[in-house]
């Protein structure tokens, strides 16, 4: 049975040619992480494994840094960021949680942060 | 088996700068961030900031920065910090250490002593 | 910054015992909590990453738990071995930071 929950960074907004953070926090399960993906819609943004470290997709390579912890943080941000991002944390013995992130990128220099809220 | 060989102590004056490095062995260099951490007896443990040796973006802590300078060589897997106009407060061991989300490993440390 | 407290900077315990080292974050850091083992003239060593999973290769009775702001470091069945100090840490935010350690004394 699963038990645990995601809570997300929620709905947030930053500035055109800013940084965010996106991330994700599993809670309420012993089981073990043994990779986080993020994707962006479909697309792989970047991949976490237990043993091998991180991937970073080679269409977001120039500005995409690990961290903190198994978070993401994403650079230069354009318009076309905005969107849906989902972390994917693969975990034995329960299977897969998923996390979902909104961002909304903006032209103007007023960008505010949205609550978080939890996924279970 | 991950391993992270850190160079010899340095005897430096005041006012200059030292460049320390921390050669990675044993996994795949581009996917792991490097983190430098400085240890005093009077501060503790600081975290001076992070580089992630994939693409060379850099995170610093604010306290550090002007004074570290990071940067990595992806061709002999070696992560290098810089420190510059070291003062008596620059004295201290400077470790290195590879993070990728799930836990870190340390090299042995570097020992910085500036001299008047 | 986040503050990370470690307020016992010395602990004295016998070999056999179990000894609880603790630490409090000064804001909710989640689950993003490391634990290290320091021994003189050493590097520091990973024991614990996300609070309660044991780095590989550490003996079992080394645990950790804890999320939010409390966390706590647990060793069970103490060994002379484990004459070290031992940090906390925070990684949920930058700038990572650093409990002020608790240094474990063997009678």
């Known amino acids: 049975m699963m038990t645990g929950t995601i809570e997300t960074t929620g709905n947030i907004s930053a500035e055109k040619g800013g940084s965010i953070i996106l991330q994700c926090h599993l809670s309420s399960t012993t089981a073990q992480v043994t990779q986080v993906n993020w994707e962006q819609q479909d697309q792989l943004l970047a991949i976490c494994n237990a043993d091998l470290g991180w991937h970073i997709s080679p269409s977001f390579k120039d500005r995409v840094a690990p961290g903190p912890g198994l978070g993401l943080t994403l650079q230069s941000l354009t318009v076309n960021d905005t969107g849906e991002y989902f972390c994917i944390y693969h975990t034995y013995p329960d299977g897969t949680y998923t996390g979902r992130i909104f961002l909304e990128v903006l032209e103007s220099s007023v960008a505010e942060h949205g609550a978080r809220f939890q996924i279970p | 088996q991950a391993y992270l060989q850190q160079s010899g102590a340095e005897l430096v004056r005041s006012g200059a700068s030292v460049k320390m490095s921390c050669k990675a062995s044993?996994?795949?260099?581009?996917?792991?961030?490097m983190h430098w951490v400085k240890q005093t007896p009077g501060q503790g443990l600081e975290w001076i900031g992070c580089?992630?040796?994939?693409?060379?973006?850099?995170n610093y802590n604010q306290k550090f920065k002007g004074k570290a300078t990071l940067t990595a060589d992806t061709s002999s897997s070696t992560a290098y910090m810089q420190i510059s106009s070291l003062t008596s407060e620059d004295s201290a061991v400077y470790f290195c250490?590879?993070?990728?989300?799930?836990?870190?490993?340390w090299g042995q440390g570097t020992l910085v002593t500036v001299s008047a | 910054d986040i503050v990370m407290t470690q307020s016992q900077k010395f602990m004295s315990t016998s070999v056999g015992d179990r000894v609880s080292v603790t630490c409090k974050a000064s804001?909710?850091?989640?689950?993003?909590v490391a634990w290290y083992q320091q021994k003189p003239g050493q590097s520091p060593k990973t024991l614990i990453y996300s609070a309660s999973y044991r780095y590989s290769g550490v003996p079992d009775r080394f645990t950790g738990s804890g999320s939010g702001t409390d966390f706590t470091l647990t060793i069970s069945n103490v060994q002379s071995e484990d004459l070290a100090e031992y940090f906390c840490?925070?990684?949920?935010?930058?700038?990572?930071?650093f409990g002020g350690g608790t240094k474990l004394e063997i009678k």
């Open positions: 840490q925070q990684y949920n935010s930058y700038p990572y930071t």
């Open positions: 804001q909710n850091v989640h689950t993003n």
């Open positions: 250490a590879r993070d990728g989300g799930f836990g870190t490993y």
């Open positions: 580089i992630y040796p994939g693409n060379v973006i850099t």
């Open positions: 044993g996994y795949t260099f581009t996917s792991y961030s």
